[in-house]
């Protein structure tokens, strides 16, 4: 454990003033694994003045960082870059004169407590005023800053000329694009202090490159992948005070593909499971032994899960018999193309010939996760498939 501190497997605390610490506590090699540390408590450490860029990076599991009644004057911009789990930061009663939002912008903080610090009234801390104004009143802190006359001024009253939130405006064409094509987005930003412009493309798969010059920026996306349909692209303007963003959703149109089609499985009903991708939503058509399959109450397509441009479902059959054995073909079609796949289904042997009523198909259960949704409502009464109801149909509830 670092000198002057105590440790457990998940916690480090350095609270005794004497002799105290002069640097952020670091674990010795071959001691506790720093990744397991979730809380660091530092108090009464008047000679601890700096958190360097690499001081905290080993504590990737850190959730709570408390440094109170100490001498903290400076925190490096990238000090918490690797600490994405940080939720609570308490820097009460230290010697901080300034603190940038750049320290914390990538963190999802529940608490940032900064009372009792001698902040200098400047644009650098205007973001704290903005943060206070957006928080609900029970959470607000009494933050003060020292003005030019070295008088304590409530942060709520802070007025700094030419110090405001930036703005971002995205001039995007219709962002519905065909797979394989390219598109260029333009963005302009403004504000004082002059903001920087950057693009947040998330986990965009398609190749992209950006150009930025002062307050203008462009993002070119080439050979657009269908995997990027539904993704959000944001233009972000950021300055000392805060950030603004303008976003668009990318819609990619592409021909359908049947990515999964398997032999029937039995649960409450028999199910021929399938997965289809396509945008716009493909129309689905089933064929039985080469002829169009007329869907009915007893044989119908059910979509269980829709994941943006991907549809997971079943051709559902009620009590199929040997009469329903055969080749089933699924065709998915939209204006960009079509795809089809076939499987052979064996539900039951012929009576008197084959008494095997439960063939060795894998018993994979297929859950109805959502209300079934029919897509591709196509029936053709002229090519009827034998009904799966071989019992007395008058007993059915219609």
């Amino acid at each position: 454990c670092p000198t002057s501190c105590k440790c457990s497997s998940a916690r480090i605390w350095c609270t005794e003033p004497s002799p105290g610490i002069v640097a952020f506590p670091r674990l010795e090699p071959n001691s506790v694994d720093p990744e397991n540390i979730t809380e660091i408590l530092i108090a009464n450490q008047k000679r601890l003045e700096i958190i360097n860029e690499d001081d905290v990076e080993a504590y990737v599991g850190l959730r709570n960082l408390t440094i109170v009644d100490s001498g903290l004057k400076f925190v490096a911009y990238k000090a918490f870059l690797k600490n994405s789990n940080l939720r609570h930061i308490n820097f009460t009663r230290n010697k901080l004169t300034s603190l940038s939002r750049r320290h914390f912008r990538h963190l999802d903080l529940s608490d940032l407590i900064l009372t009792g610090n001698p902040f200098t009234c400047s644009c650098d801390i205007m973001w704290l005023k903005t943060l206070q104004e957006t928080k609900s009143s029970p959470d607000t802190q009494d933050l003060y800053c020292l003005n030019e006359s070295s008088k304590n001024m409530p942060l709520a009253n802070l007025q700094i000329p030419n110090c405001g939130l930036p703005s971002a405006r995205l001039a995007a064409p219709n962002l519905t694009v065909e797979e394989g094509k390219s598109v260029t987005l333009s963005c302009s930003v403004g504000g004082d202090p002059l903001p920087t412009l950057y693009w947040d493309v998330g986990n965009l798969v398609s190749k992209h490159m950006n150009e930025t010059s002062h307050t203008q920026g462009s993002l070119r996306i080439t050979n657009i992948s269908s995997d990027d349909s539904g993704k959000q692209i944001s233009c972000v303007a950021e300055n000392l005070v805060g950030e603004d963003q303008d976003s668009v959703n990318l819609t990619v149109h592409f021909a359908p593909t049947i990515t999964f089609l398997e032999s029937p499985t039995s649960d409450h009903h028999w199910c021929i499971p399938f997965t289809v991708r396509g945008n716009p939503k493909p129309a689905l058509q089933w064929f039985y032994n080469g002829a169009i399959l007329n869907e009915s109450k007893y044989i119908c397509t059910k979509i269980h899960v829709t994941n943006h441009t991907e549809y997971h479902g079943c051709l559902q059959l009620d009590n199929p018999t040997h009469m329903n054995n055969g080749d089933y073909t699924l065709m998915a079609k939209n204006e960009y193309g079509k795809d089809e796949r076939q499987i052979s289904a064996h539900f039951m042997g012929r009576p008197g010939v084959d008494y095997e009523t439960n063939p060795n198909y894998p018993e994979v259960l297929y859950e109805d996760w959502t209300t079934p949704t029919d897509i591709g409502d196509t029936t053709n009464k002229s090519n009827e498939i034998p009904s799966t109801d071989v019992a007395d149909q008058s007993n059915r509830e219609h």
Epitope: T15, E16, S18, P19, V22, K46
Partner: antibody, heavy 118, light 108 residues
Framework: QVQLVQSGAEVKKPGESLKISCKGF????????IGWVRQMPGKGLEWMGI????????RYSPSFQGQVTISADKSITTAYLQWSSLKASDTAMYYC???????????WGQGTMVTVSS | QAGLTQPPSVSVSPGQTASITCSGE??????VSWYQQKPGQSPVLVIY???KRPSGVPERFSGSNSGNTATLNISGTQPMDEADYYC???????????FGTGTKLTVL
């Protein structure tokens, strides 16, 4: 040489005020806490409070809060313990203590005997 | 932390090991220091941070701390070790240090 030198013995009457001192030599007085410890005749040691001369952050033991005032003047590397109205029960030896970067309260003054009697 | 409890007195023959205990709730979570005070003198630090010895303190002084108890051991005790011994720890509830009740060590 690192040392703390305390002011001399005091004999006072109840109700009188008093301020005793503790001057630091040979170390960075501003950057290390100073503490005051009471020892009544024939009794054990009791922490009264501590002060950080660099910013005058002061902590008092609950039993001494409001009874005494601890202060420091970093410009002359001196800490103080004062009473506004002494009582007979304040009769005791008072020690100041500080620490170096490695030790915990490893520097002690020689003590100041305060006698309060009518 | 309500306080630190020490035995009022411990007796030991010269050359033997003297053990003085200090008890307090979750004391192992705090650092413990030990002070020696001879009659008419200021206290002297003999152990800090549970088991560290300041320079000039003989090796026969050692310390340990775990659970609810800290211990000061003096091996090969000498007549010059006869004194009052106080443990000390940080009390986070009051943000101040607290001394133990003190133990008088007698070397028979």
């Amino acid at each position: 040489q690192v040392q703390l030198v305390q002011s001399g013995a005091e004999v006072k009457k109840p109700g009188e005020s008093l301020k005793i001192s503790c001057k630091g030599f040979g170390y960075s007085f501003t950057n290390y806490w100073i503490g005051w410890v009471r020892q009544m005749p024939g009794k054990g040691l009791e922490w009264m409070g501590i002060i950080y001369p660099g910013d005058s952050d002061t902590r008092y033991s609950p039993s001494f809060q409001g009874q005494v005032t601890i202060s420091a003047d970093k410009s002359i590397t001196t800490a103080y313990l004062q009473w506004s109205s002494l009582k007979a029960s304040d009769t005791a030896m008072y020690y100041c203590a500080s620490h170096t970067k490695d030790g915990t309260w490893d520097i002690w003054g020689q003590g100041t005997m305060v006698t309060v009697s009518s | 932390q309500a306080g630190l409890t020490q035995p009022p007195s411990v007796s030991v023959s010269p050359g033997q090991t003297a053990s003085i205990t200090c008890s307090g709730e979750r004391l192992g979570d705090k650092y413990v220091s030990w002070y020696q005070q001879k009659p008419g003198q200021s206290p002297v630090l003999v152990i800090y941070q549970d088991d560290k010895r300041p320079s000039g303190v003989p090796e026969r002084f050692s310390g340990s701390n775990s659970g609810n108890t800290a211990t000061l051991n003096i091996s090969g005790t000498q007549p010059m070790d006869e004194a009052d011994y106080y443990c000390q720890a940080w009390d986070s509830s009051t943000s101040l240090y607290v001394f133990g009740t003190g133990t008088k060590l007698t070397v028979l």
